[in-house]
């Protein structure tokens, strides 16, 4: 045979490729032997032209021979060398990690090394680097940043040999959500002040949305969804408006349906409506509330009343939106066009949330039947959501 | 199919006592507020009271409060209507009436109804 | 309360006339009305709801309109079996009342 050469080269196996002898052949001897690694011999029929060489050492050059034998006869030998590749260091695993430390640990490849290249990186790009000692088997992490995701990697180095890269991914601690997709998850991050805060919906940090949380009522952690304080806001406004939201987060404005149908898609939420009046104060929670999509003209779903304003939500529950310019109510009449607002109508309301401000005429005013009837338009009014089991959340983080 | 059977009508002496009963089957029970109408005979319809789906809010007619006491047990689905102070106006037919989805107040489903006499 | 006036108390007509009965509530109601037919010897059944709103089954000659204090039932061509006592109800508010009956007969 002729032209012996090795490809495929791994840590562990190698394919030895020749060029056949010209006269035909019955068998092929191989043999194969390394450094401190006992020769290893094998025949294979005359017909074949390669043969995969498995359970080599990692890191070690092999000298690899063959000849062809035809009854007693025997050819000549060829020879050739090849370096088996250095074998990569296995179970990188992150452990102890808190919010800017780390400690990696991982087990030592078979081959003799003379060191190993760590590199980490955070999803910002940030990229750092280190070589430590042949007989190192963990490292420390420091100067990390919290809430953050790391993607360390590991390679073993033997003089010009380098092994493949492992690696092994985890977030740093500090906050317990680095994305928030409410505000109870804010809350849970350790922020207790009502705000505006960043939330991302369903925890994508592309889908960023501004948002103010009380942090206050009832333990905190909603997302106001509605707020009616001054009259300084127009609340007669389109579909489309209403669907995108609108106002001043701080002032008085609505999210927007939209948003609330893929904060509500997110899990089960409770939905808290506050109230005052002259000094007066009402509450009433829903411990199940959502809004639908726009296919279903953001279809209301809301049960399990409690609180002391009384139960006037029950008379809109699986209704449509409505706005004057698109009546999806139950009524013969436009009920938002009637009642210059917009809401969840059907035949009309038993709440005018969005109705006109300091309108004490009949229906017309910002109302909440069962606490104040129809003939007094509310002072204020927030509407606002949060996880149905959020107190559990919180037990769980306070006992952390 | 839904329906309502309503039970315990009878003679009853007036200042006396009864409790009528209403079987409920077809659908469920606890998620809607139930009540009780009355009609005297040849006359109109007119509403004695009413209670939420949990049962945590009663309401009553002027004419029947502090005299009548409406509750319900969910795990068997019946309603009940404890009568007491009985008047010879309170002589009507008693229907059981289920309420709507939202609020309640409105009656899609009716019992055949009992009949109180209240009469010495 | 609310007090629910219909008229007329009572009507006579024929099979095939068209039957107009109106409620009219003492106090601005919005829509919360529904009507009820009543057979002699039998329960009440409601017919519409929400004011215009017609009940699952029932069928299309009947219809309701209004808003506010004034509503209106119409049988667009009445049948043997409408002949009945139809009630109007308020649902807007405790005590739910009714209006004190009409009654369709024959001519």
């Known amino acids: 045979p002729s032209g012996l050469v090795t490809a495929n080269i791994t840590d562990s196996e190698a394919l030895a490729r020749w060029q056949p002898a010209i006269a035909t052949v019955d068998s092929y001897v191989i043999s194969y032997t390394g450094e401190k690694v006992p020769e290893i011999t094998r025949t294979v029929s005359g017909n074949t032209v390669e043969y995969a060489l498995t359970d080599l050492e990692p890191a070690t050059e092999y000298t690899l021979r063959i000849f062809a034998e035809k009854g007693p006869q025997k050819s000549s030998t060829i020879t050739a060398k090849f370096t088996t590749d250095l074998d990569s260091p296995r179970d990188l695993t992150a452990t102890e990690v808190q919010s800017e430390t780390a400690l990696l640990t991982w087990r030592p490849p078979r081959a003799s090394v003379t060191g190993y290249l760590l590199v980490y990186e955070s999803v910002d790009g940030t990229v750092k680097e280190v070589i430590v000692g042949p007989d190192t088997t963990s490292y420390s992490l420091a100067d990390l940043s919290p809430s953050t995701h790391y993607t360390a990697k590991i390679q073993a180095l033997n003089g010009p040999l380098r092994s493949n890269m492992i690696q092994t991914i985890f977030t740093t601690i500090g906050l317990l959500y680095p994305f928030p997709k409410d505000c109870s998850q804010a809350m849970l991050n350790g922020d207790t002040t009502s705000g505006l805060y960043t939330i991302y919906l369903n925890g994508d940090k592309a889908e960023a949305l501004e948002v103010f949380c009380d942090m206050t009522s009832d333990g905190g952690g909603w997302i106001v969804f509605l707020r009616r304080k001054n009259g300084r806001e127009n609340f007669y406004q389109n579909w489309k408006a209403y669907a995108a939201g609108f106002g001043d987060r701080r002032e008085e404005f609505w999210l927007g349906l939209d948003n609330l149908n893929k904060i509500t898609a997110q899990g089960q939420y409770e939905l808290r409506v506050d109230l005052r009046d002259h000094g007066e104060t009402a509450f009433a929670v829903y411990d199940k509330f959502s809004v639908g999509d726009a296919k279903t003209r953001y279809k209301l779903k809301v049960e399990g009343y409690s609180g002391t304003a009384g139960d006037s939500m029950a008379y809109h529950n699986g209704r449509s939106f409505s706005t004057f310019d698109k009546d999806t109510d139950s009524a013969i009449t436009n009920c938002a066009l009637s009642y210059k607002g917009a809401f969840w109508y059907r035949n009309c309301h038993r709440v005018n949330l969005m109705g006109r401000y300091g309108d004490n005429n009949h229906s017309q005013g910002v109302n909440w039947f069962h606490w104040k009837g129809h003939e007094h338009s509310i002072q204020f009014a927030e509407m606002k959501l949060r996880p149905s089991n959020f107190r559990n959340l919180e037990g769980r983080r306070k006992r952390a | 199919q839904v329906q309502l059977v309503e039970s315990g009508g009878g003679l009853v002496q007036p200042g006396r006592s009864l409790r009528l009963s209403c079987a409920a089957s077809g659908f469920t029970f606890d998620d809607y507020a139930m009540h009780w109408v009355r009609q005297a005979p040849g006359k109109g319809l007119e509403w004695v009271s009413g209670?939420?789906?949990?049962?945590?809010?009663?309401y009553y007619a002027d004419s029947v409060k502090g005299r009548f006491t409406i509750s319900r047990d969910n795990a068997k689905n019946s309603l009940y209507l404890q009568m007491n102070s009985l008047r010879a106006e309170d002589t009507a037919l008693y229907y059981c009436a289920k309420g709507t989805v939202g609020e309640g107040d409105t009656f899609d489903i009716w019992g055949q109804g009992t009949m109180v006499t209240v009469s010495s | 309360d609310i007090q629910m006036t219909q008229s007329p108390s009572s009507l006579s007509a024929s099979v095939g006339d068209r039957v107009t009965i109106t409620c009219r509530a003492s106090q601005y109601i919005q829509g919360f009305l529904n009507w009820y037919q009543q057979k002699p010897g039998k329960a009440p059944k409601l017919l519409i709801y929400?004011?215009?709103n017609l009940e699952t089954g029932v069928p299309s000659r009947f219809s309701g309109s209004g808003s506010g204090t004034d509503f209106t039932l119409t049988i667009s061509s009445l049948q043997p079996e409408d002949f009945a006592t139809y009630y109007c109800q308020q649902s807007y508010s405790t005590p739910q009342t009714f209006g004190q009956g009409t009654k369709v007969d024959i001519k």
């Open positions: 929400d004011a215009s």
């Open positions: 209670i939420s789906g949990s049962g945590g809010s009663t």
